[in-house]
């Protein structure tokens, strides 16, 4: 009818000039629709270039929205990973400055004189916890070798023992057992402890680090066209009062977000895997309990060298055969006191059962992140009809929305009659963080079985992807050990997004 | 067998900084200490600091500690001594040497390099 | 930090000569001195580490001695080839310290 055709695009207006448009684009009223491209082409308040701005307004508003809810994602990450990495660096300071404190009055030079292999010793263990490419087994036999070799000067000044000499020590010293038990004890615990906290912070890190790249992956055409028809084709067509459909919303975004969708699977294995490692924080080998207490296990294994100098000196000297007396030299060292340290297990703090209280809680809270997504943005951004079904806005005019709701992910979206998606294409950005996730989920596995997946040579395979860019410095091209020369591949998953605590430090 | 090999000479400004090399080969790089010691003209030794390449831990002679800095590269077994605010006394040659076993004793040494301050 | 004081400062001495040189540290170093060799234009080259033991490829006339504070570098038969300048240094704990050097020449 006349009167229809000549409808004032007054709303229209001020809409567009509120986007920041220029209002000289804008109809006075309605016009004839056959340049719409995207829109119905029925009368319409919008002209070529208005439909094509506000497509690109729509895609970028879209995006943005991703990004939002992508970003609360990453936060509540960060600030976990943050929150656990500063307790469990704290442990292991808190540690070696007990050490520094304590060992000087409880060992004296026997402490003094070998300041330095207890400092690398801590500068190892937080290396391997932070990411670097270091087996920590072999870091420690060599701490006690060279700890050992020089004790072993030290209690006995008045012996020549030239390197051959030494040499014939450390092949001895496995059999001797000259620390006791400490080291084997600090070796499993120790092993278990570690391993389960830089896995579950790397877990953080790499789940943190997908979130950013999936936020990055760009909405194709066909989905562009969707959204403008989803979010601005009712104010084209004189509807501007009319929301979308729930269900025409998510469809559209369910085939715009069809490949994020398929992270799910993968993503709950992650999640799930954090969830069940907070397990191994807890008890005697539990990662309070062992990274709080090196000191103590250092201790006891110098306590019993002491204890054990006299038989250990017989049968090294039945092994390595009697070495020569240093005429000019002192005596052999007197006997020190025991060192007397705190008891080996720290009461729990507190701190670390409400870390993992909460980061339990907002994982699980997250687990549905990628299939809720389109579901969430529909509700919080896109304003949707709470009216009745037949007064919202379907794509064509205001009524029903007849279609099914797909499911979710990319071949759920065969038929999708809002989105027109490429099955067969998967996205490779995407593809690629599913791997970060099947990899870190190893990880955690294998970490929840004590195992350090980076030196089980059954995962040695080669192969592997991702972004290589977790790495810390240049933690990741590290040797992993004085006595071999054998290095490993990079790694990949050294705490992503983590700034270096722990300086160089000088001293 | 363990080798050290040093950059080249430099001439350098007053108030400038300097950055030598010493890469290192046939041995595990990350397994030893590496030090610095430096040498006047017709001077005896003096020791700079040392680093452990493993980890990138640093000790710095007091003397030097404001104006030296030293690094290392794993990916290429390379460690650097940079000394900054250079004056005409800091004219020496400049050794890496690295440790015999984890012990302070210095049993092999770079070629040297001579860095002369002058205006 | 540690001072060490060796002497003589110089000394001329005969092919075949005995000559000892030595090493007086300003607190105990227990058995961590070392001895190098410097030749000119030359690095220094290790000689006897921890007081007494002979680094591995050094002939056996040279020798080192001593314990706690005093310590001494011994080459009981001079060769030409043992003209150089000697220091010493302690690995007791750092900053590590060199000896001011003693230079032999051969009469």
């Known amino acids: 009818d006349p009167a229809s055709k000549s409808r004032s695009c007054g709303e229209v207006r001020q809409i567009y000039g509120a986007k920041g448009f220029s209002l000289s684009d804008v109809p006075q009223a309605e016009i004839s629709g056959e340049h719409l491209r995207i829109c119905p082409q029925g009368y319409t308040c919008c002209t070529s270039e208005m439909e094509e701005n506000l497509a690109n307004r729509s895609h970028a508003e879209l995006e943005t929205a991703l990004r939002d809810s992508s970003r609360v994602l990453q936060a509540m990450l960060a600030t976990q990973l943050r929150s656990f990495d500063d307790h469990f660096q704290h442990l292991l300071n808190d540690s070696e400055r007990t050490l520094q404190a304590t060992f000087p009055g409880a060992f004296g030079e026997l402490y003094t004189q070998n300041a330095r292999a207890f400092r690398d010793l801590y500068s190892e263990l937080r290396l391997y916890y932070r990411g670097a490419n270091l087996h920590l087994e072999e870091t420690l036999a060599e701490f006690w070798a060279r700890l050992l070799e020089r004790l072993f000067k030290q209690l006995h000044p008045q012996l020549l023992l030239p390197d051959d000499y030494l040499d014939c020590l450390g092949k001895q010293a496995e059999a001797l057992r000259p620390f006791g038990e400490a080291p084997r004890e600090l070796r499993l615990r120790a092993t278990r402890a570690f391993v389960a906290a830089r896995s579950f912070v790397q877990g953080l890190g790499v789940a943190s680090d997908v979130v950013r790249k999936v936020a990055q992956v760009p909405l194709g055409p066909e989905c562009s066209r969707a959204v403008m028809k989803l979010v601005y084709c009712a104010h084209c067509l004189g509807v501007p009062g009319a929301r979308p459909c729930p269900d025409y919303c998510r469809n559209v975004l369910k085939g715009c977000l069809a490949n994020q969708a398929d992270l799910d699977a993968e993503w709950r294995n992650l999640l799930d895997s954090m969830v069940l490692i907070t397990d191994k924080f807890w008890g005697t080998s539990g990662v309070e309990s062992v990274i709080g207490s090196v000191h103590t296990w250092l201790a006891e294994a110098i306590n019993a060298l002491q204890d054990n100098r006299d038989t250990l000196t017989a049968k090294v000297i039945q092994g390595c055969g009697n070495p020569k007396v240093n005429p000019q030299g002192p005596g052999p060292e007197e006997k020190r006191r025991r060192g007397k340290l705190a008891p080996r297990e720290r009461p729990p703090s507190g701190t670390l059962e409400k870390l993992v209280s909460e980061a339990k809680a907002q994982l699980r809270d997250v687990q549905d992140f990628w299939i809720s997504l389109p579901g969430t943005l529909c509700s919080e951004k896109m304003a949707l009809s709470t009216a009745s079904d037949d007064r919202c806005w379907n794509g064509m005019a205001r009524g029903r929305y007849l279609p099914e709701v797909m499911g979710d992910g990319l071949a759920n979206q065969i038929n999708n009659p809002e989105v027109e998606v490429d099955i067969t294409k998967p996205d490779m950005t995407i593809r690629q963080q599913i791997m970060q996730l099947k990899i870190m989920t190893n990880r955690l596995r294998s970490a929840y079985n004590g195992n350090d997946v980076d030196f089980q040579d059954a995962s040695d395979d080669g192969s592997g992807s991702g972004s290589g860019d977790g790495c810390l410095d240049d933690l990741c091209s590290r040797k992993v050990s004085r006595k071999s020369s054998s290095s490993r591949t990079p790694l990949t998953h050294a705490l992503p997004g983590l700034s270096e605590q722990e300086g160089q430090k000088t001293s | 067998q363990v080798q050290l090999v040093q950059s080249g000479a430099e001439v350098k400004k007053p108030g400038a900084s300097v950055k030598v090399s010493c890469k290192a080969s046939?041995?595990?790089?990350?397994?030893?200490?590496m030090h610095w010691v430096r040498q006047a003209p017709g001077q005896g030794l003096e020791w700079m600091g040392e680093?452990?390449?493993?980890?990138?831990?640093?000790t710095y002679n007091q003397k030097f500690k404001a104006r030296v800095t030293m690094t290392r590269d794993t990916s290429t077994s390379t460690v650097y001594m940079e000394l900054s605010s250079l004056r005409s006394e800091d004219t020496a040659v400049y050794y890496c040497?690295?440790?015999?076993?984890?012990?302070?004793?210095?049993?092999?040494w770079g070629q040297g390099t001579l860095v002369t301050v002058s205006s | 930090a540690i001072q060490m004081t060796q002497s003589p400062a110089s000394l001329s001495a005969s092919l075949g000569d005995r000559i000892t040189i030595t090493c007086r540290t300003s607190?105990?170093?227990?058995?961590?001195l070392n001895w190098y060799q410097q030749t000119p234009g030359n690095a220094p080259k290790l000689l006897i580490y921890?007081?007494?033991n002979l680094q591995s490829g050094v002939p056996s006339r040279f020798s080192g001695s001593g314990s706690g504070r005093d310590f001494s570098l011994t080459i009981s038969s001079l060769q030409s080839e043992d003209s150089a300048t000697y220091y010493c240094?302690?690995?007791?704990?750092?900053?590590?310290?060199f000896g001011q050097g003693t230079k032999v020449e051969i009469k």
């Open positions: 040497a690295r440790e015999k076993r984890d012990d302070g004793v210095f049993a092999y």
């Open positions: 046939g041995y595990t790089f990350t397994g030893y200490y």
């Open positions: 680093i452990n390449p493993s980890t990138g831990d640093t």
């Open positions: 607190q105990t170093v227990a058995g961590y």
């Open positions: 921890s007081a007494s």
């Open positions: 240094q302690h690995s007791y704990s750092t900053p590590y310290t």
